[in-house]
Amino acid sequence: LVVTPPGPELVLNVSSTFVLTCSGSAPVVWERMSQEPPQEMAKAQDGTFSSVLTLTNLTGLDTGEYFCTHNDSRGLETDERKRLYIFVPDPTVGFLPNDAEELFIFLTEITEITIPCRVTDPQLVVTLHEKKGDVALPVPYDHQRGFSGIFEDRSYICKTTIGDREVDSDAYYVYRLQVSSINVSVNAVQTVVRQGENITLMCIVIGNEVVNFEWTYPRKESGRLVEPVTDFLLDMPYHIRSILHIPSAELEDSGTYTCNVTESVNDHQDEKAINITVVESGYVRLLGEVGTLQFAELHRSRTLQVVFEAYPPPTVLWFKDNRTLGDSSAGEIALSTRNVSETRYVSELTLVRVKVAEAGHYTMRAFHEDAEVQLSFQLQINVPVRVLELSESHPDSGEQTVRCRGRGMPQPNIIWSACRDLKRCPRELPPTLLGNSSEEESQLETNVTYWEEEQEFEVVSTLRLQHVDRPLSVRCTLRNAVGQDTQEVIVVPHSLPFKV
């Protein structure tokens, strides 16, 4: 940011005009007393942004801090801010006016404070006095800020002489408070209860000897008061606890319970609130979606997770093909249900090193005396493809055939390709795809079988080659969602007496 004039302090003539400019690489704005005075914004051809603040008919009340800042500092690296302090010496203005809260200075510890009496003219001599004394106090004065130092609990005034008249500031009152901060914590035995169950809340305050507890709760608003019990936790000094106990809760007891604690010496306070829900009966609710078809990869571990809400705590069972599952001693299956919050649960079924036999219909059932929910899905075991056989034969018809057999789950795709130039292919030349209907030189026949017991597909594909006039490398590639496998065979012409 570039500010003109650069300051950092300017002394300007009363009743005159003066312009402050600020330029930057992003939009800029002038601020005065946390407000944006009317100003002109502009953007130059070189991309520089400027803001022009024209101060007209200046008076002593224009004395003070002016800040230039980026209009929107969120997108910028540094929250840069330029400060300018302007004095407008004005004999008609004595001390600059203060907000009421600036006249009362509260302290909670012995620390340096500032009595903010400021004048419009930096040449004026300003002195600080106790309200009822004439002796000037030896405290340093900054014309831009006021008197800074460590002060007693007293009343103070500032004095200056403008021309031939003595001017007094308003009185400033300094109060030192002895405070022990209050920190309240509220918790409930349960934040969800069924009607007829008890609600019990505890409010604890640390570090104070004398406090007053006040509870607000739904019953109180209808005039039905509950008497809290207050006790001291003997094993912990200055721990005071208030217990609010509501037996046999009703639906109308749902709502916000607030504990307000007041420290009687200095009247400091703190409050905390907690929400209680009273339900007519228990519930179990699924959270989120679990697809009806799930996948696991053969020999890999797979965790299936269900998230639900329940109150009271439910029993959780897992089934496979309607048979109850339990943790297996061999460590092949692990079941766990954990409470992640008061009413939220995560149930997990972990299959370790998945086997084909673990495919099937799985169900999780969560239930208690009031409600139940169940979730089912089919688990498919995906098996990487493998080429089991690739063989070449010479039927009597004169054509040559290559048969490729492989298995996998889900169903594999088969891709046939050939290389005619054995020296350069496939490293330098890409193999040619075979089996397209446009290819008259080759014909393709593919059969797919699903083996129920192994729960996988078998693909058998036969490639018929019409005439092979030189050695040919034929490659069979099987592919599915979890892998691919390739084998190749060299097919030689009938006329050649040998085969590689």
Epitope: V2, T4, P5, P6, V11, L12, N13, S16, T17, F18, V19, T21, S23, A44, Q45, D46, T48, S50, L58
Partner: nanobody, 117 residues
């Protein structure tokens, strides 16, 4: 204290041009902020163009591309070349100058520009 005197105002038809001059009573070398303002009847004074530290001049959107401000240090004069004038440009035009060490900015007395057919 520097004094500024404007000239060059007058009556002009829409689409016409005028060149305003602002002569300073002493060297304008120390001026680091120069600007042209205008005040139309019944309206507040508004900024038209300004230059900081003699760098590129900035213009308000309503005049950008039509007005050009410049300065001649040797002649101690500021200029505002106004082209393609419109009826809404009718106003009293003031030049303004300010230095970093000055305690107040200085205004010219103003010159009337009227754009009418």
């Amino acid at each position: 204290e520097v004094q500024l005197v404007e000239s060059g105002g007058g009556l002009v038809q829409p689409g016409g041009s005028l060149r305003l001059s602002c002569a300073a009573s002493e060297s304008i070398f120390s001026i680091n902020y120069m600007a042209w303002y205008r005040q139309a009847p019944g309206k507040q004074r508004e900024l038209v163009a300004f230059s900081i530290d003699g760098s590129s001049t900035n213009y308000v959107d309503s005049v950008r591309g039509r007005f050009t401000a410049s300065r001649d240090n040797a002649e101690n004069t500021l200029y505002l070349q106004m082209n393609s004038l419109k009826p809404e440009d009718t106003a009293v035009y003031y030049c303004y100058a300010q230095g970093n060490t000055w305690a107040a900015g200085v205004w010219g007395q103003g010159t009337q520009v009227t754009v009418s057919s």
